[in-house]
């Protein structure tokens, strides 16, 4: 369960994926579409607002007041439109919908070192936001070991 | 109850080597990053190694890059560090610490309660 | 690499006093700090993480702010168990941290 309905920070932040594409995101038909993409060089990288939340894993453990808690985060590009993870169809998605969110809309951090992130399907452990044939979709992940995968890596900047 | 337990340090001549040692329990080890942060005598904190969940990423402060190495059993619940090639600026207590969160980098949760090394001839 | 700066490196107030500690990143950090309070002879122990939440069973006296590159601790009424090493901490862009701030007792 989330610990608490309001995120604990924020961060205003650009997505690429580890090979340095950008995650762009394209209103088409008043609907939003995401694409992974090379930037020009002096092209405006769009930026997300991820929210972070604390989430207790559900365990015995007990001890120093954080074990089992992960960081669970949000990303919304847009006023009102979050990403959600569509598991039917292991695709990723942006609706618009207003809070309390889903938990289609929450995924479970995970970093390789500070700024290189994974993304993890709250409603589908294992299942991660992934690239594949230039679009987000939902990758499962079968051990530890393939979360160092390339493709489900993604770096967080400022610029 | 959460424990870090260090252990491994002592008098070391300097070029020498010594391995530390932190074992873990009242937590699911596998699941936090752990690192190693030491203190010389009378000085403030410093961030000396990291080693994410499955062990599989290592990083390390730049003045010991090339002489220690962290690792982890997750099997038995520990996290060393072995130090070659020691220096007297090497000389502090080391402490042993977990992250604050499953498998994320953020903060250190829990501490353990240190173990000096001393560097000298 | 990032540097941090705390300020000032010894700090002395009355028990009940307002005190607050700054601290200083050389690069915007995105409120991917803490602090850490370590009384002599002991480990250091979290206090605050990502800027202002508070550790589980510390004190609701100790608060933390800030954005960017300035970060402050405050502890609203200063009380003698207070007295430590308060060291600031980021984690925006690898590991560092502040040289720390010394509180005393007047």
């Known amino acids: 369960s989330i610990t608490g309905i309001s995120p604990i920070t924020e961060y205003l932040a650009s997505l690429s994926t580890y090979n340095d594409q950008s995650i762009t995101f394209a209103l088409e038909d008043e609907s939003y579409e995401i694409y992974v993409e090379d930037l020009k060089k002096d092209e405006k990288k769009d930026k997300v607002l991820l929210s972070y939340y604390e989430s207790q894993h559900p365990s015995n453990e007990s001890g120093d007041g954080v074990d089992g808690k992960m960081l669970m985060v949000t990303l919304s590009p847009t006023k009102d439109f979050w990403l959600h993870a569509n598991n039917k169809e292991h695709s990723v998605e942006l609706h618009k919908c207003e809070k309390p969110l889903p938990d289609q809309a929450f995924f479970v951090l995970h970093n390789m070192h500070s700024n290189c992130v994974s993304f993890e399907c709250k409603t589908d452990p294992g299942v991660f936001i992934g690239v594949k044939d230039n679009h987000l979709a939902l990758i499962k992940v079968d051990s530890s070991e393939n979360l160092c995968t390339e493709n489900i890596l993604f770096k967080l900047s400022e610029t | 109850e959460v424990q870090l337990v260090e252990t491994g340090g002592g008098l070391v001549q300097p070029g020498r080597s010594l391995k530390l040692s932190c074992v873990a329990s009242g937590f699911t080890f596998s699941n936090y990053w752990m690192y190693w942060i030491r203190q010389a005598p009378g000085m403030g904190l410093e961030w000396v190694s990291s080693?994410?969940?499955?062990?599989?990423?290592?990083y390390y402060l730049d003045s010991v890059k090339g002489r220690f190495t962290i690792s982890r059993n997750n099997a038995e619940n520990t996290v060393y560090l072995q130090m070659n090639s020691l220096r007297s600026e090497d000389t502090a207590t080391y402490y042993c610490?977990?992250?604050?969160?499953?498998?994320?980098?953020?903060?250190?949760?829990?501490w353990g309660q240190g173990t000096l090394v001393t560097v000298s001839s | 690499d990032i540097q941090m700066t705390q300020s000032p490196s010894v700090l002395s107030a009355s028990v009940g006093d307002r005190v607050t500690l700054s601290c200083k990143a050389s690069h915007n950090i995105n409120k991917h700090l803490d602090w850490y309070q370590q009384k002599v002879g002991e480990a250091p122990k979290l206090l605050i993480y990502?800027?202002?939440n508070l550790q589980t069973g510390i004190p609701s006296r100790f608060s933390g702010s800030g954005s960017g590159t300035d970060y402050t601790l405050t502890i609203s009424s200063l009380q003698p168990e207070d007295v430590a090493t308060y060291f600031c901490f980021q984690y925006n862009s690898g590991w560092t941290f502040g040289q720390g701030t010394k509180v005393e007792i007047k």
């Open positions: 080693i994410n969940n499955d062990g599989g990423n290592t």
């Open positions: 990502f800027t202002n």
């Open positions: 610490a977990k992250g604050h969160y499953y498998y994320t980098s953020y903060s250190f949760g829990y």
